[in-house]
């Protein structure tokens, strides 16, 4: 039975050209997390193993930071970032747990973040 | 290499108090649930408390709960067993353990025993 | 709670013969994500428990081949083809596919 739930950064946005951090929490389970896999529709953003530590997707480096923790960090901002990221916990005996972003990049200085919400 | 060291038993009396402590070293201890498990004399092993790699979550059996609670320093690559309200029954040796590979006990320290006697 | 049953609880062995150690579950430890996470610990005389088997049949590292895994759904079964004088101390069967995690009460080989 999973018993984990995941809390995420929610619905965000941010400015064109700026930064973000795309963040995800796993709790209420003691399962062993093998691997973070972050993606980006079906797009392959970055790997977070246990025992190998970070991977970045070769089209994603240059603006792909790792961190902080098992979170990821977007650079340099642009329209079409814009869309929906997904963080995805691979763990013993639990099995997987997703979590979902939506990033909104606005061209303004209108940007706000979006409150927390939690994933079960 | 991963390695596991206990430390901190001993001999208290019953109702007290003890700490004990697993140094880990040879892989990204923060990365890993670790658990504790006890063996008493002559007995079977038994699992008494777990703690996810963050710290955040935790896990006892009801022979522990409210008197036993583990946590972590990543920062110091240490586990914990705070051991609180000992019973002669809590006397054991207490092993440290991590998973991997799919395994949940791929491997353990060496042990260190506590003795509840007065 | 899951209750893991050892038998025999007692094994004296020939070296170079065969043994085989049984374990079942008072119900089944498939998880719902379709592993069994079922393990086999040996513990030697005066040392900590090692890890033979695990997910019913796939060995640890540095496990030599003699020791194997078997078994599905309420009963698993370790082997050993051929024993050797450093096979002695007591095995362990252990399902963590359930909360509470549970050991079998052990199983001790001895030489003849």
């Known amino acids: 039975m999973m018993t984990g739930t995941i809390e995420t950064t929610g619905n965000i946005s941010a400015e064109k050209g700026g930064s973000i951090i795309l963040q995800c929490h796993l709790s209420s389970t003691t399962a062993q997390v093998t691997q973070v896999n972050w993606e980006q529709q079906d797009q392959l953003l970055a790997i977070c193993n246990a025992d190998l530590g970070w991977h970045i997707s070769p089209s994603f480096k240059d603006r792909v930071a790792p961190g902080p923790g098992l979170g990821l960090t977007l650079q340099s901002l642009t329209v079409n970032d814009t869309g929906e990221y997904f963080c995805i916990y691979h763990t013993y005996p639990d099995g997987t747990y997703t979590g979902r972003i939506f990033l909104e990049v606005l061209e303004s200085s209108v940007a706000e973040h979006g409150a927390r919400f939690q994933i079960p | 290499e991963v390695q596991l060291v206990e430390s901190g038993g001993g001999l208290v009396q019953p109702g007290g108090s003890l700490r004990l402590s697993c140094a880990a070293s040879g892989f990204t201890f923060s990365s890993y649930t670790m658990s504790w498990v006890r063996q008493a004399p002559g007995k079977g092993l038994e699992l008494v408390a777990e703690i996810s790699s963050s710290g955040g979550s935790t896990y006892y059996p009801d022979t522990v709960k409210g008197r036993f609670t583990i946590s972590r320093d990543n920062s110091k690559n240490t586990l914990y067993l705070q051991m609180n309200s000992l019973r002669a029954e809590d006397t054991a040796v207490y092993y440290c353990?991590?998973?991997?590979?799919?395994?949940?006990?791929?491997?353990w320290g060496q042990g260190t025993l506590v003795t509840v006697s007065s | 709670d899951i209750v893991m049953t050892q038998s025999p609880l007692s094994l004296p062995v020939t070296p170079g013969e065969p043994a085989s150690i049984s374990c079942r579950s008072s119900q089944s430890i498939v998880h719902n994500s379709g592993n069994t996470y079922l393990e086999w610990y040996l513990q030697k005389p005066g040392q900590s428990p090692k890890l033979l088997i695990y997910k019913v049949s796939n060995r640890f590292s540095g496990v030599p081949d003699r020791f194997s895994g078997s078994g599905s759904g309420t009963d698993f079964t370790l082997k050993i083809s051929r024993v050797e004088a450093e096979d002695v101390g007591v095995y362990y069967c252990f399902q963590f596919s359930h909360v509470p995690r549970t050991f079998g009460g052990g199983t001790k080989v001895e030489i003849k």
């Open positions: 353990a991590r998973p991997g590979l799919g395994a949940w006990f791929a491997y």
